[in-house]
């Protein structure tokens, strides 16, 4: 008995209000009179009275109108006391279901969709997604349910039904072919959202659809043939700028240039570079030109993108023509550097070489030749012939010019062009050694004791080379063997020097002759400090006072 | 049990004047019915004036007073009110307080108030 | 507005005859009318709401129907307290309405 079915009640309700929904009754009414109250939000608790019941009747009223899209649902309990406060029945639940009205037109989630999709893509391709909202019940009435469409589109171009909208999830495809971005970048769809599946009120926005490149343009040379001059040798030079046009979106992958030389360019003496701004091929030399060899060069250059062609497209060819001027070119020693051997100590006058430079110049240019730089002033040359000869004496041992047996001079040539060039050469003179230098004992001063004395080590050296040098030997002269003994070591690079009779305490000449390999001898004179004293000392000790 | 209303407050006014009627109420439980206000003409017509809801959430009007005329009650003192202001000589009339009872409106009315707007 | 028009505006019958007043609605109301009872001394009571349903303390002699837009009140058999005025009110549409009155005299 004491039970209410789910009360379903139409949002927005014109009333009059309070408005009748449904009695409360109990059947303990018979035995006693019942007073009858509702609990729950909506009725006592917030929002307080939209719904009341008459104590004494139970007539359950709606006070306002109601709205689906704030409360769905209320759950209120009625109850039910009998004249003195006591409950006669337990809680009933109260549903009171508001049930929707079509009183909200679909909403689109932005006043702009941006989307964007390749040119040339096939119908049937997903552009972008649209969304709209609708308060109202989608779940069962068709009050919430949208249907998209589109309502125009802009431009018209190639025509007006390049795209398509699905009605239920709003996406956004191509339905036609011949998007074509350098014809049309941009379409703006109006887009439609109606509610009741399409039967109901409508609303727009709009969807921007920004087509995006794809490489279906090839570069095209303009002009397609260029001549050039070039100096000869320069290398680095600019050649020629290739200006290209492409018609896709600049400063994109599609629209940067690749430049590629085919041909005419045997020597690879060429290279090619693309601007990063104005997107031209930079032609430079990679190598000096020649123009002896070969005065005109006709390259062959190729264009492409950055980015592959999306389709078969045919490429642009240039036709460059470069013609390579004449320079006056400096005359060149050959070799470069050239190697001489040559006899340390050669007379004044005797020719040491010919050195000479050939001019890469066509016409028979004069050549004359001088020396630039010789550090000792040893060598000249003839200004004609480029001989050189030996002015002063060639000495190996030379340590201030000569490193490693090699003496460096630089020569210049220079040619009577206008105007004159000039080149540079390096003559490097290896000096054969000669036996001009004899044994030297080191050191030369030596200090003995004249009672068990011990022997002195002396080193010998010799400024030249093997074979003019060790084994040495040695030998006392000028009556220096009375008191001295002088031997060479087993090895031939040491002399011992012994005092072998008692000499007072004094400073003495020891006359020591040492010969080389070569039979050089060279006399030196040893100064010996003999001290009073035994066996080793290296200064003499003062004299001894008693006290 | 027998329901009781009734109304004062009733005067002669002016018209652009303000007039508070008053509506007692006893012998039911006041506080969970709602009540409206009608009027009767001098031609005998009566007319709706107002209604507020058992808790005085909500209240509602005809055009014709909409604006100028206010319903309140208290609760506590079981007493129903009717704030009138910006009176023209239309609104002169006999005003009754009644009681809805079963969910239906006008079941219990007093025996009225008499309202003349008049220069 | 929502008219409701009353007929007849005036009745004169005599004691123990039946009687019936109209109210006739220009919109579907459903079961939402009542009749009001005017006396002389101006005092006003609800006889019948919803159509049908009567008040308490209201005598079986009154009973309310409908037809289509067409409402009753008919009295079967009029007594002396029966005589003054009569008014329909509808409350099925908002403003609430009355009937213009039928004024109910003794032949």
């Known amino acids: 008995d004491w039970v209410v079915a789910p009360i379903s009640v139409p949002e927005n309700g014109k009333g009059p209000f309070p408005q009748r929904l449904n009695q409360l009754k109990s059947n303990k009414d018979r035995d006693t009179k019942i007073f009858y109250s509702i609990t729950g939000p909506g009725a006592d608790s917030p929002p307080e009275g939209v719904f009341a019941v008459e104590k004494e009747t139970g007539w359950l009223l709606l006070n306002k109108p109601l709205d689906r899209e704030e409360i769905a649902k209320y759950e209120l309990f009625g109850h039910a006391v009998s004249e003195n406060g006591a409950s006669v029945e337990d809680p009933m639940n109260i549903s009171i279901i508001v049930t929707d009205q079509n009183d909200h037109k679909p909403k689109f989630t932005q006043d702009t969709f941006r989307g964007s999709v390749l040119e040339g893509v096939l119908p049937g391709t997903s552009v972008m997604q649209v969304t709209a909202t609708d308060e109202d019940d989608a779940i069962y009435t068709y009050n919430g349910v949208v249907a998209y469409s589109i309502h125009s589109q802009e431009p018209k171009d190639p025509h007006d039904l390049m795209f398509t909208i699905h009605r239920s999830t709003g996406t956004i495809s191509v339905i036609s072919s011949g998007l074509d971005r350098e014809k049309v970048p941009e379409y703006t769809l109006t887009i439609q959202a109606t509610d009741m599946d399409g039967d109901g009120s409508t609303t727009t926005a709009v969807a921007v659809v920004e087509i995006l490149d794809a490489n279906d343009n090839a570069p095209m040379f303009d002009p397609q043939k260029y001549e050039a001059h070039v100096p000869e040798n320069a290398v680095g030079h600019e050649v020629q700028r290739l200006t290209v046009t492409d018609l896709d979106a600049p400063n994109s992958p599609a629209w940067r240039a690749t430049y590629l030389i085919m041909g005419g360019d045997d020597g690879d003496h060429f290279t090619i570079t693309t601007h990063p701004e104005s997107n031209q091929g930079i032609l430079t030399t990679r190598k000096g030109l020649d123009f002896e060899a070969k005065n005109q060069h006709t390259l062959y250059v190729e264009v492409t993108n950055e980015a592959p062609f999306v389709l078969k497209l045919p490429t642009s060819t240039a036709t460059i023509v470069v013609h390579v001027e004449d320079v006056n070119e400096a005359p060149v020693f050959v070799p470069p550097s050239k190697v001489v051997e040559v006899q340390e100590g050669i007379p004044t006058g005797e020719p040491v070489c010919v050195y000479t430079a050939e001019d890469p110049d066509k016409e028979n240019q004069k050549i004359s030749y001088r020396i630039l730089r010789d550090p000792a002033g040893w060598l000249a040359m003839d200004p004609d012939s480029g001989q050189v000869t030996a002015v002063g004496t060639l000495d190996r041992e030379d340590e201030q010019f000569v490193r490693n047996n090699i003496y460096e001079v630089m020569v210049l040539a220079m040619d009577n062009g206008s105007p004159p060039t000039t080149g540079t050469g390096t003559l490097l003179l290896t000096l054969i050694d000669v036996n001009d230098h004899g044994p030297v004992p080191e050191p030369r001063q030596i200090t003995i004791c004249n009672q068990s004395p011990v022997r002195q080590v002396l080193n010998i050296t010799d400024k030249d080379l093997s074979p003019h040098t060790s084994p040495f030997q040695a030998q006392l002269t000028d009556d220096s063997d009375i008191y001295w003994t002088a031997e060479v070591n087993e090895e031939g690079d040491t002399v011992v020097l012994s005092l072998k009779k008692f000499l007072k305490q004094d400073t003495y000449d020891v006359h020591l002759s040492l010969s080389d390999h070569g039979n050089k001898e060279q006399l030196t004179v040893i100064r010996a400090t003999v001290c009073d004293c035994h066996g080793h000392v290296e200064t003499c000790p003062g004299p001894w006072k008693g006290g | 049990e027998v329901q009781l209303v009734e109304e004062s407050g009733g005067d002669l006014v002016k018209p652009g004047g303000s007039l508070k009627l008053s509506c007692a109420a006893s012998g039911f439980t006041f506080s969970t019915y709602g009540m409206s206000w009608v009027r009767q003409t001098p031609d005998k017509r009566l007319e709706w004036v107002a209604t507020i809801s058992s808790g005085g959430h909500y209240s509602y009007y005809p055009d014709s007073v909409k604006g100028r005329f206010t319903i309140s009650r208290d609760n506590a003192k079981n007493t129903l009110y009717l704030q009138m202001s910006s009176l023209k000589s239309e609104d002169t009339a006999m005003y009754y307080c009644a009681s809805y009872y079963y969910g239906s409106p006008f079941a219990y009315w007093g025996q009225g108030t008499t309202v003349t707007v008049s220069s | 507005e929502l008219q409701m028009t009353q007929s007849p505006s005036s009745l004169s019958a005599s004691l123990g005859e039946r009687v019936s007043l109209t109210c006739r609605a220009s919109q579907d109301i459903g079961s939402s009318l009542n009749w009001l009872q005017q006396k002389p001394d101006g005092t006003i009571k609800r006889l019948i709401y919803?159509?049908?349903s009567l008040d308490s303390g209201v005598p079986k002699r009154f009973s309310g129907s409908r037809s289509g837009s067409d409402y009753s009140l008919t009295i079967s058999s009029l007594e002396s307290e029966d005589f003054g005025d009569y008014y329909c009110?509808?409350?099925?549409?908002?403003?609430?309405?009355f009937g213009a009155g039928t004024k109910l005299e003794i032949k």
């Open positions: 009110v509808q409350y099925g549409s908002s403003p609430l309405t």
């Open positions: 919803d159509t049908s």
